[in-house]
């Protein structure tokens, strides 16, 4: 058993049929010694008396809010949560496996630049009685500070018969140098509590590996005289690290119709303009990637050919 | 030293082309190592990230773009003295800082070159003959060093008398390649920045 926060405790249980469970001793936070009784949740049934209560925690029915009283007055609470371990593996029932970039990916994180700010998100099908708390640091043995905000519900989607909820959190490394060469990874820890179930999820990464620039901005077309060719130009996204001559991007320019199966014109360039062949009912799209360290491509920025 | 025929623009900052070749060569070698040593811990997640130049050179600090010198987190300044000549400075009014930056890059390359050559000598003794260092990568390091053209004491190649542990050597190779790739990215950014200045 360990304390998650004030008056909230996590009991770690090996979860298998007829498991013996864990013996837990609760102590009432009071100077009183006599006349103390214990109850669980909303029940008025007295579970025991005295300053301490010893219980055998085996299942979710044994978890919940234990309250000690004296003469009708509440003295203190202890909330017990369960953390299940099945076949030596901690349960991951609350969050959905996103399977990208690999199996057992519950947290996904991205950064728009090298400033030390990043966003992580996760998915669940649970809609109520759900709380998240996020902590982060650079390195684990001698951790350096990363400050994370509160996790918020950022999107809701319908997936077949199920509703899927996306939560996200923004974090900022306390003293980040965009030009630094990372040798210690960022660690992100998410505590998830659904009703009386506790789970924790972690992710470890270098900012350089989670970079995904915003799409290029200000796409403009200039038809070339006596030609089907069009000069397309664009600018670096505002959110990208500066100076751009140091933090350079490379670009992919594509002309394609509405269907992905349609024919296309595609060219890669380090410049902020390119010449392509425009077709009726097609769109010109441009995306960006760090020129020197190949992490993710940005989403496409598009303009119609016409 | 003459630049290769295909360098796009003869007036170009002389080291940019070499630094691009360097990053490409290191990335290719790292990819080859990850494929060949698939049963060894050789991915970014599996290895310890060590920097053999730590406390010996200060490339990131010395080569910081002017725009980032206002960022206090970037000014983890270390006092290091370097030689201040070099052909990449040709026909440019170069600040002392730029000379410091380029000589720091030169020292990095020299240290990695020694490490790689020592390691290759060990790998050549491996009866499995599983992996060797790409000669192209070693040649590209040499070309960039010559383009930088700093005079500096030669570092003797480390020789070891004891029987090499090939497993450890291969893991060390992965660690070294990962670190060198990160440094090659920094070098490429620096050259691009100086070329634009």
């Amino acid at each position: 058993i360990w304390e998650l926060k004030k008056d909230v405790y996590v009991v770690e249980l090996d979860w298998y049929p007829d498991a013996p469970g864990e013996m837990v001793v609760l102590t009432c936070d009071t100077p009183e010694e006599d006349g103390i009784t214990w109850t669980l949740d909303q029940s008025s049934e007295v579970l025991g008396s005295g300053k301490t209560l010893t219980i055998q925690v085996k299942e979710f029915g044994d978890a919940g809010q234990y309250t000690c009283h004296k003469g009708g007055e509440v003295l203190s609470h202890s909330l017990l949560l369960l953390h299940k371990k099945e076949d030596g593996i901690w349960s991951t029932d609350i969050l959905k496996d996103q399977k990208e970039p690999k199996n057992k990916t519950f947290l996904r994180c991205e950064a728009k630049n090298y400033s030390g700010r990043f966003t992580c998100w996760w998915l669940t099908t649970i809609s109520t009685d759900l709380t998240f708390s996020v902590k982060s640091s650079r390195g684990s043995s001698d951790p350096q500070g990363v400050t994370c905000g509160a996790a918020t519900l950022s999107a809701e989607r319908v997936r077949g018969d199920n509703k899927e909820y996306e939560y996200s959190v923004e974090c900022q490394e306390d003293s980040a140098c965009p030009a630094a060469e990372e040798s210690l990874p960022i660690e992100v820890m998410v505590d998830a509590v659904h009703k009386l179930k506790y789970e924790n999820y972690t992710s470890s990464f270098f900012i350089r590996d989670i970079i995904k620039p915003d799409p290029p901005k200000n796409l403009q077309l200039k038809p070339l005289k006596n030609s089907r060719q069009v000069e397309v130009s664009w600018e670096y996204p505002d959110t990208w690290s500066t100076p751009h001559s140091y933090f350079s991007l490379t670009f992919c320019v594509q002309v394609q119709g509405k269907s992905k199966r349609e024919k296309k014109d595609r060219v890669f360039t380090d410049k902020t303009s390119a010449t392509v062949i425009c077709r009726k009912n097609a769109s010109i799209s441009v995306r960006a990637q760090d020129r020197y360290y190949s992490s993710s491509w940005s989403e496409w920025a598009s303009v119609p050919c016409s | 030293r003459n630049l290769p025929v295909a360098t796009p623009d003869p007036g170009m900052f002389p080291c940019l082309h070499h630094s691009q070749n360097l990053l490409r060569a290191v990335s290719n070698m790292l990819q080859k190592a990850r494929q060949t040593l698939e049963f060894y811990p050789c991915t970014s997640e599996e290895i310890d990230h060590e920097d053999i130049t730590k406390d010996k050179t200060s490339t990131v600090e010395a080569c910081l773009p002017l725009e980032l010198t206002k960022n206090e987190s970037c000014l983890n300044s270390r006092e290091t003295s370097f030689i201040t000549n070099g052909s990449c400075l040709a026909s440019r009014k170069t600040s002392f800082m730029m000379a410091l930056c380029l000589s720091s890059i030169y020292e990095d390359l020299k240290m990695y070159q020694v490490e790689f050559k020592t390691m290759n000598a060990k790998l050549l003794m491996d009866p499995k003959r599983q992996i060797f260092l790409d000669q192209n990568m070693l040649a590209v390091i040499d070309e960039l060093m010559q383009a930088l053209n700093f005079n500096s004491e030669t570092v003797p190649q480390k020789s070891s008398l004891e029987e090499p542990d090939f497993y450890k050597t291969k893991i060390k190779l992965c660690i070294l390649l990962h670190a060198f790739r990160i440094r090659a990215v920094t070098i490429d950014r620096v050259m691009s920045y100086l070329n634009a200045s």
């Epitope: 060719q229 024919k263 060219v267 | -």
Partner: antibody, heavy 118, light 107 residues
Framework: QVQLVQSGAEVKKPGSSVKVSCKAS????????LHWVRQAPGQGLEWMGW????????EYAPKFQGRVTITADESTSTAYMELSSLRSEDTAVYYC???????????WGQGTLVTVSS | DIVMTQSPLSLPVTPGEPASISCRAS??????LHWYQQKPGQQPRLLIA???QSISGVPSRFSGSGSGTDFTLTISSLQPEDFATYYC?????????FGQGTKVEIK
């Protein structure tokens, strides 16, 4: 299986024209760009131009501009390349080729040998 | 026009040994570079697109690298069926242009 079948070999006199055909099968004809590339005996590859069969748009290499005409007939899934004012240095194997990507080629015809000789 | 220069023009290799072919562009072409193989009396065959992207059906012993002006096609271990002429092609701008070809021959 995508296939491009070209017309047979031709012998032409200098100053005359030649029209080589290329019939496509497998896949929708207008879903691909069609290119013509030639190869003189013992020499390398030389790109001549492309056509978009969907709208008839063409682009020619400056070297052949004014001498080459690429056309396409959607109804028969056939592309044509006509080269005029032939000279002996136009002796080559002419390939038609196609791809959904405009700037490189993934399927080639078997080639048509055009010999220009007096 | 962008001039593509291949080297060497002839490459004698022992079967089972690796081979590398270089292709240089007269100006920077990013990764807009493709590789083809041609055997005598046959049409060319696409091997690699955009400098390093493998093509389905092409053996994994063929790999490409490079960007900007310098590109390399590598065959990790030459098989008897790999003896052929190899061409690079730039797609950075029209007209599309090819290298002059590299003939890989049995040593």
């Amino acid at each position: 299986q995508v296939q491009l079948v070209q017309s047979g070999a031709e012998v032409k006199k200098p100053g005359s024209s030649v029209k080589v055909s290329c019939k496509a099968s497998g896949g929708t004809f207008s879903d691909y760009y069609l290119h013509w590339v030639r190869q003189a005996p013992g020499q390398g590859l030389e790109w001549m131009g492309w056509i978009d069969p969907e709208n008839g748009d063409t682009e020619y290499a400056p070297k052949f501009q004014g001498r080459v005409t690429i056309t396409a007939d959607e109804s028969t899934s056939t592309a044509y390349m006509e080269l005029s004012s032939l000279r002996s240095e136009d002796t080559a194997v002419y390939y038609c080729a196609r791809n959904k990507e405009l700037r490189y080629i993934d399927v080639w015809g078997q080639g048509t040998l055009v010999t220009v000789s007096s | 026009d962008i001039v593509m220069t291949q080297s060497p023009l002839s490459l004698p290799v022992t079967p089972g040994e690796p081979a590398s072919i270089s292709c240089r562009a007269s100006q920077s072409i990013s990764i807009n570079l493709h590789w083809y193989q041609q055997k005598p009396g046959q049409q060319p065959r696409l091997l690699i697109a955009f400098a390093s992207q493998s093509i389905s059906g092409v053996p994994s012993r063929f790999s490409g690298s490079g960007s900007g002006t310098d590109f390399t096609l590598t065959i990790s271990s030459l098989q008897p069926e790999d003896f052929a002429t190899y061409y690079c092609q730039q797609s950075n701008s029209f007209p599309l242009t090819f290298g002059q070809g590299t003939k890989v021959e049995i040593k």
